[in-house]
């Protein structure tokens, strides 16, 4: 694979994870109820990371925005953040990228130049798509812990009616913004990773391209290592550089989006 | 205006089929949740179906689940109840009604009267 | 399946008097997600269908009367009627509308002396 071709496609598969990192995080379904202990429920409750919403079989949904900073969870408020920070990283990442593309020409930037800023943008993108695999990935463990501790007391306070009457506490499982972030999130890293591969393509090798001219005893003649590269002339200016063919492929984008059912 | 408005309620011998529609008016069907409610000679209301809003899911009550089948055409406005393999005991007189906030049914139609009698 | 137990089955009252019915659930009503009950009261009149009167165990339905008011969470509602017309009696029914089956409770009947 050409170095250009690498970077351009480093960026699109960042930029497809990156616009799936802002969707997951704006999305309201992080959360869904668990519908196996009630499977035929009229209401169906789903929470995302800004407000929690109820959708009745009537075909009304009703959301709540989380309207408090202070009596929210830490962990809610740490995934929030860690979002947001693979969103900022993210547009910066794109812009710098965007600079950084072979295929764009900006003035007189030259290679090592762009090598940088091709880097730069590669390890905003690795660490935008480390920042939304965590984040995820905190919130579904918070999830599963708070699963098995409402399981273990699923039917609480056993009052009223002597007894006899079952309060069933809602549970809550993976929504489809979980999947979403994942798949987001190692878009965002595989793109990045290319990015940096593609850096390396772009960056100059100095004894490729630095004439060296030395005299021999009795002879003048000037010898350009690496100059007799297969047609590219004596006095070129062409630069030969490494192409990395290496393992920067995706699986053919084979990114699978979660349905979302409508359990109610 | 909206209106509901049943049709489709017979006399019929146990084991027979009767197809209920529900002609809905002042609003577009496929936006809510429908459900039929049937009133038995001795006064008692007794959900029946609900299919919700877009028509994804439907929910049968027990003593009419694999015999009755809930049902819409967008299009015409109109909500069905398709009903089969009728006993005694299915006879009511059946309501249609939209689903409103809370599930709570807004409006119902006057109903039709379903006899299932030898 | 919810069951719901209407109390009492009937009641004979005067016209003005304050009126109060009480409906139970065998599983708690109250939705975590909006803390909301999903119980619904309706009204209905000798050859008429049901009227909808209160949803939300307590948000009374836009042209009813402000003398009906419905209370409780949880398992344990109450629709009171503070003054009573003779329009008022009819058969009121309570409705879990929270889990399917959607079931109804038997009906107060409300009755003039």
């Known amino acids: 694979m050409s170095v250009t071709a690498c970077q351009g496609l480093g960026f699109v598969v960042s930029l497809i994870g990156f616009a799936g990192i802002i969707a997951a995080t704006c999305m309201d379904q992080w959360s869904t109820q668990d519908l196996y202990n009630n499977p035929v429920t009229a209401v169906f409750n789903y929470q995302g990371l800004w407000r929690s919403c109820v959708r009745e079989s009537s075909g009304f949904t009703e959301c709540r925005g989380y309207f408090t900073l202070l009596g929210l969870p830490a962990m809610l408020q740490a995934v929030r953040a860690l979002m947001i920070v693979g969103i900022v990283l993210g547009v910066i990442g794109i812009l710098v990228s965007i600079f950084a593309l072979k295929c764009i020409r900006i003035g007189s930037m030259d290679d090592s130049a762009k090598a940088k800023m091709t880097l730069t943008s590669g390890i905003l993108f690795i660490i935008s798509g480390i920042c939304a695999i965590i984040g995820v990935s905190v919130f579904a463990n918070m999830l599963v812990t708070n699963f098995w501790m409402s399981t273990a007391n699923m039917y609480s306070g056993m009052g009223g009616m002597g007894g006899m009457v079952q309060t069933v506490q809602t549970r809550y499982t993976f929504g489809a913004a979980l999947f979403v972030g994942w798949v987001a999130g190692g878009l965002t890293l595989i793109g990045g990773v290319m990015m940096c591969i593609a850096c390396r393509g772009l960056t100059p090798d100095d004894s490729n391209f630095k004439a060296v001219s030395y005299h021999a005893s009795g002879q003048n003649v000037a010898y350009r290592p690496g100059g007799f590269k297969a047609s590219t002339g004596f006095g070129s200016n062409t630069r030969n550089k490494k192409i990395y063919d290496g393992g920067a492929r995706t699986e053919d984008d084979e990114q699978s989006h979660p349905t979302k059912y409508d359990y109610v | 205006e909206v209106q509901l408005v049943e049709s489709g309620g017979d006399l019929v011998q146990p084991g027979g089929s009767l197809k209920l529609s529900c002609a809905a008016s002042?609003?577009?069907?496929?936006?809510?949740?429908m459900s039929w409610v049937r009133q038995t000679p001795d006064k008692r209301l007794e959900w029946v179906s609900t299919?919700?809003?877009?028509?994804?899911?439907?929910y049968y009550s027990d003593s009419v689940k694999g015999r009755f089948s809930i049902s819409r055409d967008n299009a015409r406005n109109t909500l069905y109840l398709q009903m089969s393999s009728l006993k005694s005991e299915d006879t009511a007189m059946y309501y249609c009604?939209?689903?409103?906030?809370?599930?709570?049914?807004?409006?119902w139609g006057q109903g039709t009267a379903v006899t299932v009698s030898s | 399946d919810i069951v719901m137990t209407q109390s009492p089955s009937s009641l004979t009252v005067t016209a003005g008097e304050k009126v109060t019915m009480s409906c139970k659930s065998s599983?708690?009503?109250?939705?975590?997600?909006?803390?909301?009950?999903?119980l619904t009261w309706y009204q209905q009149k000798p050859g008429q269908p049901p009227k909808l009167l209160i949803y939300?165990?307590?948000t009374r339905e836009s042209g009813v009367p402000d003398r009906f008011t419905g209370s409780g969470s949880g398992t344990h509602f109450t629709l009171t009627i503070s003054s009573v017309q003779a329009e008022d009696l009819a058969v009121y029914y309570c409705?879990?509308?929270?889990?399917?089956?959607?079931?109804f409770g038997a009906g107060t009947k409300l009755e003039l002396k």
């Open positions: 409705q879990n509308d929270y889990s399917y089956p959607l079931t």
């Open positions: 002042g609003f577009t069907l496929s936006r809510y949740g």
């Open positions: 939300w165990a307590s």
């Open positions: 299919i919700i809003s877009g028509g994804i899911n439907t």
């Open positions: 599983q708690s009503l109250l939705n975590s997600g909006n803390q909301k009950n999903y």
């Open positions: 009604g939209r689903l409103y906030y809370g599930n709570a049914m807004d409006y």
